[in-house]
Interface confidence: low
């Protein structure tokens, strides 16, 4: 239904706390360089205005769209051109072009320092002094670094953060209580960020239809007892929610997500028997819980998929009459039978099925032509299964750090032109798939591995789009979203690459490395490893292992030495010489 005042409607639906949080996220995602105080001031102004509209929906400007109201606020910021350059040109446009312009200027890799966590005592002091400001800072810092973070989910993580601080700041040993818990939230939030970015990429590059297909497959796996009409309804609603969030319409997105959660909890009987635990929770926890609810038990009596989609005499007629619906039912039926497949794989199979029908239904004897389609799925299914087995075996053998290094070598060989920081970030993220997925039961590994890798590779593509340097990467990133991971996996050593000259300073280290946290030490070593591969792309695994072992030994020795600086300055050049010899 239409409301006289959109802003009053959203304020009433969401309540003041969530309203303010979402407006802060929206502003932080659009203007990523502004300070917290600048944004907090804008948020307060918008909230005060919303309250006047709640009191009187006919008040001046209350009938304006949210884009108009928010855009006007952003465009009124002083020194916009000085701080944001051509983004200021957006302010010369009218809605909806102005909002589109803001969206195009979102930066997936803003030049902001890493979000450092203060030490426990300081954190607890500022949290106790003003919990609202403390949480506002958290929302601001995460949102500006992740401009497509799923806003209602970010409110959920802020709530988690709040609960952890409330609990741990009351403990004697705050540090050991906070660190593992906050690390857990950070890890989950980072995964949530890349997953959501993938959804927005799907929406932006391939439209709502592509996202809806993803949603149908995912929902059918989770709710195999729901009928096709129910799955379609949920997929349509979920597509709307994601479209709104990806489009910066965060108030509508959060409101519609709450509605969808309400609908699911009120219609459990036609959806799934696993929802009640989620439905007992308060709003943010409920929606989060529903988004990762366990798969319902598959119906025992499902007929073979071939009956309706291969053996039926009416296949071509049914396909011709309503292509999207017929393909949708195929995707639904195949997905509900295969919770053990990745969504990407299911979409590749649906694409293969569609291509087969397009070709065969134009021939003289269609059934003879499409009769073998299910057998033709076999290689498409085997490829990711082999990928999972090979990589999980390697992970079990090497551990997370060693596995990351193996991936780093592989990807540097595939795309040596890509910047070393991007390669290291990608390899570290890709390598975490082992810890995340390889420890799961067999039937959960494939969906976990492939859908996670796809999300990480989407980030690689986004970063590469900014400064395209590798034809290999451009080729894989230009194709369809579901073909990306197989495309990257199939890449081999880039034969067109001219190896980098050996520069001694790249491999020169100083004693300050000794005091770095373990993660930072690893990044330094991995940076050196990528540089080695760029120097010798065809170096064997044994050669690289020799060099890296020598390097690790050198660090260990010098960091334990009484006079570290002397050790680094005398032993460093020897290490460089040995490296050159080992790779000669």
């Amino acid at each position: 239904e239409a409301h006289k005042s959109e802003i009053a409607h959203r304020y009433n639906d969401l309540g003041e706390q969530h309203f303010k949080g979402l407006v802060l996220i929206a502003f932080s995602q659009y203007l990523q360089k502004c300070s917290y105080d600048e944004h907090a001031k804008l948020v307060q102004e918008v909230t005060d205005f919303a309250k006047t509209c709640v009191a009187d929906e006919s008040a001046a400007n209350c009938d304006k769209s949210l884009h108009t109201l928010f855009g006007d606020k952003l465009c009124a910021i002083p020194n916009l051109r000085e701080n944001y350059g051509e983004l200021a040109d957006c302010c010369t446009k009218q809605e909806p072009e102005r909002n589109e312009c803001f969206l195009q200027h979102k930066d997936d890799n803003p030049s902001l320092p890493p979000f450092e966590r203060p030490e426990a005592e300081a954190m607890c002091t500022s949290f106790k002094e003003n919990p609202t400001t403390f949480m506002g800072h958290y929302l601001h810092e995460v949102a500006r670094r992740h401009p497509y973070f799923y806003a209602p989910e970010l409110l959920y993580y802020a709530e988690q953060y709040n609960e952890i601080l409330t609990q741990c700041c009351a403990e004697a040993d705050k540090e050991s209580c906070l660190t593992p818990k906050l690390d857990g939230v950070k890890e989950k939030a980072l995964v949530s960020s890349v997953r959501q970015r993938m959804k927005c990429s799907s929406m932006q590059k391939f439209g709502e239809r592509a996202f809806k297909a993803w949603a149908v497959a995912r929902l059918s796996q989770t709710f195999p007892n729901a009928d096709f009409a129910e799955i379609t309804k949920l997929a349509t609603d979920l597509t709307k929610v994601n479209k709104e969030c990806c489009h910066g319409d965060l108030l509508e997105c959060a409101d519609d997500r709450a509605e969808l959660a309400k609908y699911m909890c009120e219609n459990q009987a036609t959806i799934s028997s696993k929802l009640q635990t989620c439905c007992d929770k308060p709003l943010l926890k409920k929606a989060h819980c529903l988004s990762e609810v366990e798969h319902d038990t598959m119906p025992a009596d499902l007929p073979a998929i071939a009956a309706d989609f291969v053996e039926d005499q009416e296949v071509c007629k049914n396909y011709a009459e309503a292509k999207d619906v017929f393909l949708g039912t195929f995707l639904y039926e195949y997905s509900r039978r295969h919770p053990d497949y990745s969504v990407s794989l299911l979409l590749r199979l649906a694409k293969k099925y569609e291509a087969t029908l397009e070709k065969c239904c134009a021939e003289a004897n269609p059934p003879a032509c499409y009769g073998t389609v299910l057998a033709e799925f076999q290689p498409l299914v085997e490829e990711p299964k082999n990928l999972v087995k090979t990589n999980c075996d390697l992970y079990e053998k090497l551990g997370e750090y060693g596995f990351q290094n193996a991936i780093l070598v592989r990807y540097t060989q595939k795309a040596p032109q890509v910047s070393t920081p991007t390669l290291v970030e990608a390899a570290r993220n890709l390598g975490r798939v082992g810890t995340k997925c390889c420890t799961l039961p067999e039937d959960q590994r494939l969906p976990c591995v492939e859908d996670y890798l796809s999300a990480i590779l989407n980030r690689v593509c986004l970063l590469h789009e900014k400064t395209p340097v590798s034809e290999h990467v451009t080729k894989c990133c230009s194709g369809s979203l579901v073909e990306r991971r197989p495309c990257f996996s199939a890449l081999t050593v880039d034969e067109t690459y001219v190896p980098k000259e050996f520069k001694a300073e790249t491999f020169t280290f100083h004693s300050d490395i000794c005091t770095l946290p373990e993660k930072e030490k690893q990044i330094k070593k991995q940076t050196a490893l990528a540089e080695l591969v760029k120097h010798k792309p065809k170096a064997t695994a044994e050669q690289l292992k020799t060099v890296m072992d020598d390097f690790a030994q050198f660090l260990d020795t010098c960091c334990k030495a009484a006079d570290k600086d002397t050790c680094f300055s005398t032993e460093g050049p020897n290490l460089v010489t040995r490296c050159k010899d080992a790779l000669a």
Epitope: N225, C265, E266, N267, Q268, A269, T270, S273, L275, Q276, C279, D280
Partner: nanobody, 115 residues
Framework: QVQLVESGGGLVQAGGSLRLSCAAS????????MSWVRQAPGKGPEWVSA????????RYAESVKGRFTISRDNAKKTLYLQMNSLKPEDTAVYYC????????GSQGTQVTVSS
Amino acid sequence: QVQLVESGGGLVQAGGSLRLSCAASGFTFGSFGMSWVRQAPGKGPEWVSAIDSGGVDTRYAESVKGRFTISRDNAKKTLYLQMNSLKPEDTAVYYCTIGQSTSRGSQGTQVTVSS
């Protein structure tokens, strides 16, 4: 099509008893927790009691604890509410719902307790 049909309501004196039934069809009854919800005239829906899918775990609103008993028979796809020591404030339309939701998807059965 999911269907819930309540029965067993009626007019009863304060202190009396009633047993409500809810016959379910169109879904796998044994897989879902169920609830009773009531709505008094001019008021919003109020959750009364819930029972898990196996009939083991039961929960009650404070206002009915010790007087009402929820149970189920999965073979018969039926949910029950035994109401003892009824009070005038128990007067309402009683609905059964799937899960622990206060949304009404059925007609309900009227319970009137006179003093």
